[in-house]
Interface confidence: medium
Amino acid sequence: AGSCSLEGVEIKGGSFRLLQEGQALEYVCPSGFYPYPVQTRTCRSTGSWSTLKTQDQKTVRKAECRAVRCPAPVSFENGIYTPRLGSYPVGGNVSFECEDGFILRGSPVRQCRPNGMWDGETAVCDNGAGHCPNPGISLGAVRTGFRFGHGDKVRYRCSSNLVLTGSSERECQGNGVWSGTEPICRQPYSYDFPEDVAPALGTSFSHMLGATNPTQKTKESLGRKIQIQRSGHLNLYLLLDCSQSVSENDFLIFKESASLMVDRIFSFEINVSVAIITFASEPKVLMSVLNDNSRDMTEVISSLENANYKDHENGTGTNTYAALNSVYLMMNNQMRLLGMETMAWQEIRHAIILLTDGKSNMGGSPKTAVDHIREILNINQKRNDYLDIYAIGVGKLDVDWRELNELGSKKDGERHAFILQDTKALHQVFEHMLDVSKLTDTICGVGNMSANASDQERTPWHVTIKPKSQETCRGALISDQWVLTAAHCFRDGNDHSLWRVNVGDPKSQWGKEFLIEKAVISPGFDVFAKKNQGILEFYGDDIALLKLAQKVKMSTHARPICLPCTMEANLALRRPQGSTCRDHENELLNKQSVPAHFVALNGSKLNINLKMGVEWTSCAEVVSQEKTMFPNLTDVREVVTDQFLCSGTQEDESPCKGESGGAVFLERRFRFFQVGLVSWGLYNPCLGSADKNSRKRAPRSKVPPPRDFHINLFRMQPWLRQHLGDVLNFLPL
């Protein structure tokens, strides 16, 4: 290795940092600027830094930070745009208007962002005359072809030095949709923001997972039990670049990101096999889909953890062809094993995620390997859903846009090729991309966990139950038509036909109101049952079910929570098929103090700790100090039966009066499970406050200290099964 002097390597307007123990350097520019002409330089064995060369191979004397600019429209059909500039500065706007008779689709005003990309969507002036809609011309692109009938083709190219991503040719298909994906012309130095990539990647992935979802329900001839068929299977191939230009630290982030991906993908109710391949000059298969362990999340993550940066120290080139070819060989072996004509082979969907930091520089064109893969999987218009290739480049300047674009799949309304600024951005994307909440089926226990999600998106099962006027209780959707809540909400014997259940709705921040078709209130509930024993209020059997007058449409804002002891929850927990209710209890309530949550009046998720075993006893004992409600209590268990979970110690939040009936839930494997429902407590933090956001922490000197009791759903199984037997698939006790 060479030793290079740092003299004269500075960049005007920016800074640099050394990588790989001084064998490489990276230029860093402020937001809205990019390093010109390169982002990284390597120290050559001759002791000099690699030359500063532009894209057209001209040599530059000194690196500089240049202002990012966004490409100008080359042509805009059937309308006008203003202002008309050669290119646009960061923060600059361009506005579009249509001529009479044409309607604007897309964004009327677009702004140039600091990454050199326009915000919004391509503006198109369309009169709706064609079989397919006018496909438009993205900013900086030129289109040939102006007929939009079935079978017509349009071609795109980019002006000057812009790079095309997406499809250079699209065909109007019989279904009125253009083949491929919208072409976008971008500056060679542009990159994607994580917050754009995550949903784009997620949408595409959700489509694939939606298609692979095994919860297709078929009625059995005997009885009305619903059987879940495990049909779909997904092979996920993760390809991690380990070439010289990837630093050891970046490789670690590649591994972490891949682990996140694996973790998320296993939280879906699909059968999945994961292959792990690292590559530099040669690929190394760490896990093959032919290995049974590829179906086991722990095994896959462990093989990822064992991936070693030094595995490739003897060959440090970037041979993307060989990496993709090892996927092809794996597919070939699996096809031979299962039989080319069998459904078992033909029904497998395949997703390849390539994480790289640059161009392939050996082994031939990776496109050839992709062609082989498409061929073996018989990918045509009908089987387009069976293969998705995601090409993700990291490090904006030295990634070859053209190559990434060539490798990524082209599907209408989806993107499969991305360039991110750094590995940190990659980590962010993988954290947020798998947003199952977009799925429209009744998959349970899915909440949007991204930072910018609304409260209702985070807990989409949460509902408000109210008589005509004020809100009184909360509840949880446990299917698309049933709500679980507390019996004491109905103790005034109000006619429940006057009641409303407010369910989350993406179209309205106020939600959507549903009438109640029937209320099933536990017959064992009687708040005055023990009055003659000096127990003024008793909340045993404080459970009720409400059947809504209509089915709730599943969305990001409305979705059931998983109820333990059901097949649905078993799938979400990724437990084997013979699991029992006892197994669920042992897995979910497995510690002396189990972190859990409930939802506050203002919609936020608050934290509690459910006390189990010995700790349950000391948690409940405090009730004996409550002399107002229980003036002469001798045995705490007369009040706190084993039907109750106990919380309220340490820094726990206490539920307010109006939060009764709401779910007490835990998170496991990115899914949410209801283990209890809010019933009663010794302290109301909202007392004396009309403000939903105001909770008064119990004064530290309060006697007795706060305690909260929640109906334990594991103790209410017979009743739940009696009323929900036709709705949910219960496991044996």
């Epitope: 934290n607 007392l687 004396g688 105001s694 008064k696 922490r697 000197s701 309060k702 006697v703």
Partner: antibody
């Protein structure tokens, strides 16, 4: 409206005790903690302790533990703070203050000046 | 005990100008999603008056030129456009746990 009315000024000899009262009106007395705060002339505010009128349970600043005693008479909605073994440095204005839903002191009495002098 | 340190000890600001007072806690006053830090104004011969509760919430009846910000250990009281009646001593106070403590106070004068 919420009102806290304190007893009048007191002059005490070192070693004696003083008992300051605070009569509350305009709200349910047992719903909120009552705190006691003192302020020596030209000095800052110093928290003495609080009492939960419902359970008559107390929390004290360690500095006053053993010397300060807080009590309530629920029937007349009045809180009391007694400070014993008075010294000259206990000369101060003593305030009662009612906590609100956020554990802040939303309402204050007018203050009682206690002078300790031989 | 959680020690609250206000800065500056005193300041003089012209009418109509912005006044800013800081309060730093020796340990975090945040719990269960809220910052248990409050601000009071005290004029000579009067009891203190609550201005801001839970770090940033304006008590009803207090003019909106007063605002509070901060989280964890660092908090600020701002008076956006100083009026003559704002000359007073300002105290921060926490109620995160016992014992509650006050800052030493900041005397604000009109320049």
């Amino acid at each position: 409206e919420v009102q806290l009315v304190q007893s009048g000024a007191e002059v005490k000899k070192p070693g004696a005790s003083v008992k300051v009262s605070c009569k509350a009106s305009g709200y349910t007395f047992t719903d909120y903690n009552m705190d006691w705060v003192r302020q020596a002339t030209g000095q800052g505010l110093e928290w003495i302790g609080d009492i939960n009128p419902n359970y008559e349970s107390t929390g004290y600043n360690q500095k006053f533990k053993g010397r300060a005693t807080m009590t309530v008479n629920k029937s007349i909605s009045t809180a009391y703070m007694e400070l014993s073994s008075l010294r000259s440095e206990d000369t101060a204005v003593y305030y009662c203050a009612r906590e609100d839903d956020h554990d802040a002191f939303a309402y204050w009495g007018q203050g009682t000046l206690v002078t300790v002098s031989s | 005990d959680n020690v609250l340190t206000q800065s500056p000890d005193s300041l003089a600001v012209s009418l109509g100008e912005r006044a800013t007072i800081s309060c730093r806690a020796s340990k975090s006053v945040r719990t269960s999603g809220y910052n248990y830090m409050h601000w009071y104004q005290q004029k000579p011969g009067q009891p203190p008056k609550l201005l801001i509760y839970l770090a940033s919430n304006l008590k009803s009846g207090v003019p909106d030129r007063f605002s509070g910000s901060g989280s964890g250990t660092d908090f600020t009281l701002t008076i956006s456009s100083l009026q003559a009646e704002d000359a007073a001593t300002y105290y921060c106070q926490h109620s995160r746990e016992l014992p509650y403590t006050f800052g030493q106070g900041t005397k604000l004068e009109i320049k």
